[in-house]
Amino acid sequence: QRLSRAQQQLPLESLGWDIAELQLNHTGPQQDPRLYWQGGPALGRSFLRGPELDKGQLRIRRDGIYMVHIQVTLAICSSTSTSRHHHPTTLAVGICSPASRSISLLRLSFHQGCTIASQRLTPLARGDTLCTNLTGTLLPSRNTDETFFGVQWVRP
Amino acid sequence: QRLSRAQQQLPLESLGWDIAELQLNHTGPQQDPRLYWQGGPALGRSFLRGPELDKGQLRIRRDGIYMVHIQVTLAICSSTSTSRHHHPTTLAVGICSPASRSISLLRLSFHQGCTIASQRLTPLARGDTLCTNLTGTLLPSRNTDETFFGVQWVRP
Amino acid sequence: QRLSRAQQQLPLESLGWDIAELQLNHTGPQQDPRLYWQGGPALGRSFLRGPELDKGQLRIRRDGIYMVHIQVTLAICSSTSTSRHHHPTTLAVGICSPASRSISLLRLSFHQGCTIASQRLTPLARGDTLCTNLTGTLLPSRNTDETFFGVQWVRP
């Protein structure tokens, strides 16, 4: 995918730089497996520079390929608590709206561990809203060094 | 955060590009949980291009948002090694100096696993020194494909 | 490493931007521990923009420092199956050709878990072919949100 001549002439900032790193705000109500995120300097080291939050979900404002990364740590957890539960705890990151673009991008299970962490490159479009669904009965930690979610625009 | 007109005119190299990938040199003496790192082409595939090492700890030389990543593998471990020991083995990456900016950025425990790997975006400032603290009784592997630590400047 | 004056004058696209995100196609025949990858919009969200596939292995076309990342999830897996099997499962990412540059870049074992995920920065050269070796008797999942492999050029 080539940059247009117009893009080549524009200042660097116009090419992207969109970036966000979020911290956990709260979990959803019953029947809502989504994690709700927050970001901003007043909250600590989280920030939003380009993407937006829509009711705790991350919305993309610029088309491009993004590096999406996440770490989630379970709050009260031992190596047996994750395997003791009938329904294993699973985290999935996906596009949840618009519905026409709904897809799971990243999925991990907490087998005998208490933390999952991963990252991937994926094309995202303006208006895509990313949801992070945590299924299971264990609660996530809200410590900002244990649970976080971020995206980084890397190329058009 | 917009780029100034001056920044827009400067060659790309002036915008950042600071990057480092380090390999484990040694662990700390008694009462010092820090891992000590080394980097440079003579050592293999590790390198420092911008950031510096100060007594085995990584010091940032350019303000910006960085992607920080780490993988640590224990030299011996098991499904029971972490539970056999009273104090679970934990890795924390944080700013350790200047003291006024001291904070934990990334924390993971080795629950029934032998490797942790994660990454996050975080704002760092010139002069920030990053420390990686490994607590517990198990030794880290020094194999360069199993244990490494790096940062990448991604935007101002 | 400075950019040459010529590089500074060229449009941004000439500086790199090489990037790929691949999905699992199939495993190798007996005695071949390599995973075989595929990519392209017709397949879903995988893509190759610069790097190429050579018989399912990723070949680099531009010198530079790359962020290499991978996630592999085992298909039929419980927290005990990884330890119960006679052949423990390990994943290694490395340069497999040219032979003169053969080296392991990233190695992880599935201890009592069913997913590994990691990333690292590493210098790669035009013509380097990356192989991902999965040793053991457990099969990887081909779900595109569970198993993927990618590289991103980050600087010269």
Partner: antibody
Framework: EVQLLESGGGLVQPGGSLRLSCAAS????????MSWVRQAPGKGLEWVSV????????DYADSVKGRFTISRDNSKNTLYLQMNSLRAEDTAVYYC?????????????WGQGTLVTVSS | EIVLTQSPGTLSLSPGERATLSCRAS???????LAWYQQKPGQAPRLFIY???SRATGIPDRFSGSGSGTDFTLTISRLEPEDFAVYFC?????????FGQGTKLEIK
């Protein structure tokens, strides 16, 4: 040439104490993790304790935990094992052993051993 | 703790013959972290094989290691007089590391 030379063994009564030393030469001692491994007369080998290159991390076999203390003095290229509350079952030849550079728990060089006999 | 069982306890062979020593683990451990040592009477153990199949420095190529998971083998393709000794296997994948009870290789 890598050399490890143990000393300090001997006869001691149950409940007594002993301090073993291991003098290292021929390599950069401060760059390697070290372990003590023992072998009861006519028996197999048993790992006892490990210490990291700089001395900040130690670990022990359950059979000696709380009674033995491993330490090192990198300025003297010497490894130590302080053994307290000794029992008859601690009778063995004690070897100091160097870990592979990767820190993996296999041992590429061993000393000749020193015999500890715990008996009344 | 992983228990390593070596067999046979004693192996009687003649120089020039092929020796096959077995080491079986009570559970599998990661990445083939198994070593073999040779010990002669009154001497310290000497590392021969690590990583299940890699020969240590100075070990002749008549010695080879194989296996993975729970079953490992040390093979001496053609016995020399100096090869008669006790051989111990050791796993170093799971804490605590542990040793087999040894196989005595004696001259027939």
């Amino acid at each position: 040439e890598v050399q490890l030379l143990e000393s300090g063994g001997g006869l001691v009564q149950p409940g007594g104490s002993l301090r073993l030393s291991c003098a290292a030469s021929g390599f950069t001692f401060s760059s390697y993790a070290m372990s003590w491994v023992r072998q009861a007369p006519g028996k197999g080998l048993e790992w006892v304790s490990v210490i990291s290159d700089s001395g900040g991390t130690t670990d022990y076999a359950d059979s000696v935990k709380g009674r033995f203390t491993i330490s090192r003095d990198n300025s003297k290229n010497t490894l130590y094992l302080q053994m307290n509350s000794l029992r008859a079952e601690d009778t063995a030849v004690y070897y100091c052993a160097r870990h592979d550079y990767s820190n993996r728990y296999y041992f590429d060089y061993w000393g000749q051993g020193t015999l500890v006999t715990v008996s009344s | 703790e992983i228990v390593l069982t070596q067999s046979p306890g004693t192996l009687s062979l003649s120089p020039g013959e092929r020796a096959t020593l077995s080491c079986r683990a009570s559970q599998s451990f990661s990445s083939n972290y198994l070593a073999w040592y040779q010990q002669k009477p009154g001497q310290a153990p000497r590392l021969f094989i690590y990583g299940a199949s890699s020969r240590a420095t100075g070990i002749p190529d008549r010695f080879s290691g194989s296996g993975s998971g729970t079953d490992f083998t040390l093979t001496i393709s053609r016995l020399e007089p100096e090869d008669f000794a006790v051989y111990f296997c050791q796993q170093y994948g799971i804490s605590p590391c542990s040793f087999g009870q040894g196989t005595k290789l004696e001259i027939k």
